[in-house]
Amino acid sequence: AILGRSETQECLFFNANWEKDRTNQTGVEPCYGDKDKRRHCFATWKNISGSIEIVKQGCWLDDINCYDRTDCVEKKDSPEVYFCCCEGNMCNEKFSYFPEMEVTQPTSNPVTPKPP
């Protein structure tokens, strides 16, 4: 193992579409991959009227977007399907959504909002 990096050897597996796909619905997935590649866990879910519906969870191949993330956090603003990835065994058991606020640089003089 490389110092300071958690190696991912297994992830929580879940498939909401397990009957159609004829897979297990849930379990633990061993993560395979080239020795020189990093491995990650992922989770995808939907927010249906405030109710969280998990779509898939499992292992994810070497992806720079997942490097050094110990927590599985979606940062995109209101996607149709939420996705997060992380490094470390079973790190996709818990997942969360913290959208990054985009700071836009004003192209002209900033407008000061009027006080109420």
Partner: antibody, heavy 120, light 107 residues
């Protein structure tokens, strides 16, 4: 070297049968999902069928369901596609492809393809 | 089934040009989006998986971007060996589906 090698293609009459084989080498065959993807002359890629590493789960495109059967023999590192009731529209180059293990499940290794021609 | 629509279906470009190919999914495929290159008479070759990760051995002039339903493959400086047909593919659900392809031809 990681390799896939298809065989079994040829000319067959409408309504006839053909069995394609795909010999795998250079990787742990039994732990990888495998697929057949076809390409009609001058057309794009069409996914045909897939099978899990153990062979316990099989999937088919609607266009071949009930006519084609995918199978594998992990002791021989070989993937098969049994094609029955062949139609003219099944004429294509058939590729076997490995669907790389964890997500996002891309086809990372392809065979060279074998041509199936259905004609009277 | 998830439909994948690619545009343009063909384009003409010169060596050194920046080329952009787009792919749209009929519903969100999250990050389960892959790109392939195919040359005449050859099998397809995986270029990019998971929207933006280059497969081993693929030159860095290739890049992928996008999210959800809209994706882009960019070749920053077209090389002679890049003239080929490019396909997007979703692996979010079964059946796996491909875009119709984009043929990149020499101008």
């Amino acid at each position: 070297e990681v390799q896939l090698l298809e065989s079994g293609g040829g000319l067959v009459q409408p309504g006839g049968s053909l069995r394609l084989s795909c010999a795998a080498s250079g990787f742990t065959f039994s732990s990888q999902g495998m697929s057949w993807v076809r390409q009609a002359p001058g057309k794009g890629l069409e996914w045909v069928s897939a099978i899990s590493g153990s062979g316990g789960s099989r999937y088919y495109a609607d266009s071949v369901k009930g006519r084609f059967t995918i199978s594998r023999d992990n002791s021989k590192n070989t993937l098969y596609l049994q094609m029955n009731s062949l139609r003219a529209e099944d004429t294509a180059v058939y590729y076997c492809a490995r669907e790389q293990g964890p997500g996002p499940y891309a086809f990372d290794i392809w065979g060279q393809g074998t041509l199936v021609t259905v004609s009277s | 089934d998830i439909q994948m629509t690619q545009s343009p279906s063909s384009l003409s470009a010169s060596v050194g040009d920046r080329v952009t190919i787009t792919c749209r999914a009929s519903q969100s495929v999250s990050r389960f989006l892959n790109w392939y290159q195919q040359k005449p008479g050859k099998a397809p070759k995986l270029l990019i998986y998971g929207i933006s990760t280059l497969q081993s051995g693929v030159p860095s002039r290739f890049s992928g971007s996008g999210s959800g339903t809209d994706f882009t493959l960019t070749i920053s400086s077209l090389q002679p060996e890049d003239f080929a047909t490019y396909y997007c593919q979703q692996s979010f659900s079964l059946p796996r589906t491909f875009g119709g392809g984009t043929k990149v031809e020499i101008k």
